[in-house]
């Protein structure tokens, strides 16, 4: 399987909420002996490999934000962490995997990485990640709502998030 990032860039005004999304593509084994470990973290550009550096999101580590479940299950981070930090990572039955950040500030700007590890019973692992940029803007140049830019080079038209 692969991980797709529907949008490579999110431009949002301060105070807005945003949901960053990744999607599992290709055949996803939903067998009993397969589980998926999913998490989010911040990283930085200009490295040899994107997403190799694992920095916290609003002081929450990749362990705090992880989801661990069978291939056909939905999952969410703890309500307690979501409430306290304005963050929630979630995964649905259709391969969508997201993190919602509430009340954005300029400090939230940066590169975000989603990671999916497919774990087969006894040993083998398949690890893939996706990356996307969040730009939080303030002042008169800031958009009134989040504007998202598709990753696909063919589809360069801006989409305004609802």
């Amino acid at each position: 399987f692969k991980v797709a990032t529907p949008y490579s860039l999110y431009v949002c005004p301060e105070g807005q909420n945003v949901t960053l999304t990744c999607r599992l593509l290709g055949p996803v084994d939903k067998g009993h002996d397969v589980t998926f470990y999913k998490t989010w973290y911040r990283s930085s550009r200009g490295e040899v490999q994107t997403c190799s550096e694992r920095r916290p999101i609003r002081n929450l580590t990749f362990q705090d934000l992880h989801l661990h479940h069978g291939g056909h299950q939905a999952a969410n981070t703890s309500h307690d962490l979501a409430q306290r930090h304005g963050l929630e990572s979630a995964s649905d039955h259709h391969g969508n995997f997201s993190i919602t950040m509430r009340n954005l500030t300029l400090l939230d700007s940066g590169l975000y990485c989603c990671l999916v590890v497919e774990i087969r019973h006894h040993h083998s692992e398949h690890r893939v990640h996706g990356a996307m940029e969040l730009q939080v803007q303030t002042g008169k140049d800031a958009p009134s709502n989040c504007v998202v830019y598709p990753s696909s080079s063919q589809d360069s038209e801006n989409i305004t998030a609802a």
């Epitope: 589980t35 470990y37 998490t39 190799s52 550096e53 694992r54 920095r55 916290p56 580590t61 990749f62 362990q63 705090d64 992880h66 661990h68 479940h69 590890v117 774990i119 019973h121 006894h122 692992e125």
Partner: antibody
Framework: QSVEESGGRLVTPGTPLTLACTVS????????MSWVRQAPGKGLEWIGI?????ITYYANWAKGRFTISKTSTTVDLKFTSPTTEDTATYFC??????????????WGPGTLVTVSS | AYDMTQTPASAEVAVGGTVTINCQAS??????LAWYQQKPGQRPKLLIY???TLASGVSSRFKGSGSGTDYTLTISGVQCDDAATYYC????????????FGGGTEVVVK
């Protein structure tokens, strides 16, 4: 790859004490490390963890009693004010966070701290 | 708070026999459970991670199972060298932890 603890000794209660864990072949900027202790004849007790991003978490009983920090080559465990209950062997250990199993795949040999008046 | 309860505290088993050790987490730990073997004067040795995956070089006589809050380590065809104390450890969370390790089970081989 290896880790080794040092600094364990006999101290009186309240005496400042810091243990050091020196790593070899391990990049502390990309690895997650932990301290675990074991009182004589007792079980393993998790003290806390320091992430590659420098974020630290402590066991509920250890909060305020210890501070974990790191440099590029060492992970330190600082005792706030040792008591006789802190007499134990202290292990430095590495978490497997690239296989995302969060098991401890590398342990040091341990260093003995004795707190006695 | 995350806490691990391990039973029994000690178990006696004959050579060739089978011993079962249980570990219960205070909350769901989503299979992020490891088992360790420790002999007197030595550092712990990783046996099993993610509840059921055997660590490199570990005998297949060791088997881990379980899910949710309840996990089991089974040692079959017990040998004299298996005499040790065994510990479980949860890796699901580092927040609000009382102890990530179970209290240990001493296995005595007759």
């Amino acid at each position: 790859q290896s880790v080794e603890e040092s600094g364990g000794r006999l101290v009186t209660p309240g005496t400042p004490l810091t243990l050091a864990c020196t790593v070899s072949g391990i990049d502390l900027s990309t690895n997650v490390m932990s301290w675990v202790r074991q009182a004589p004849g007792k079980g393993l007790e998790w003290i806390g963890i320091i992430f590659d991003s420098d974020i630290t978490y402590y066991a509920n009983w250890a909060k305020g009693r210890f501070t974990i920090s790191k440099t590029s080559t060492t992970v330190d465990l600082k005792f706030t004010s040792p008591t006789t209950e802190d007499t134990a062997t202290y292990f430095c250990a590495r978490y497997d966070t690239y296989g995302y199993s969060y098991s401890i795949d590398l342990w040091g040999p341990g260093t003995l701290v004795t707190v006695s008046s | 708070a995350y806490d691990m309860t391990q039973t029994p505290a000690s178990a006696e088993v004959a050579v060739g026999g089978t011993v079962t050790i249980n570990c219960q987490a205070s909350e769901d730990i989503y299979n992020l459970l490891a088992w360790y073997q420790q002999k007197p004067g030595q550092r712990p040795k990783l046996l099993i991670y993610r509840a059921s995956t055997l660590a490199s070089g570990v005998s297949s006589r060791f088997k881990g199972s379980g899910s949710g809050t309840d996990y089991t380590l089974t040692i079959s065809g017990v040998q004299c060298d298996d005499a040790a104390t065994y510990y479980c450890q949860q890796g699901h969370s580092s927040r609000n932890v009382d102890n990530a390790f179970g209290g240990g089970t001493e296995v005595v081989v007759k």
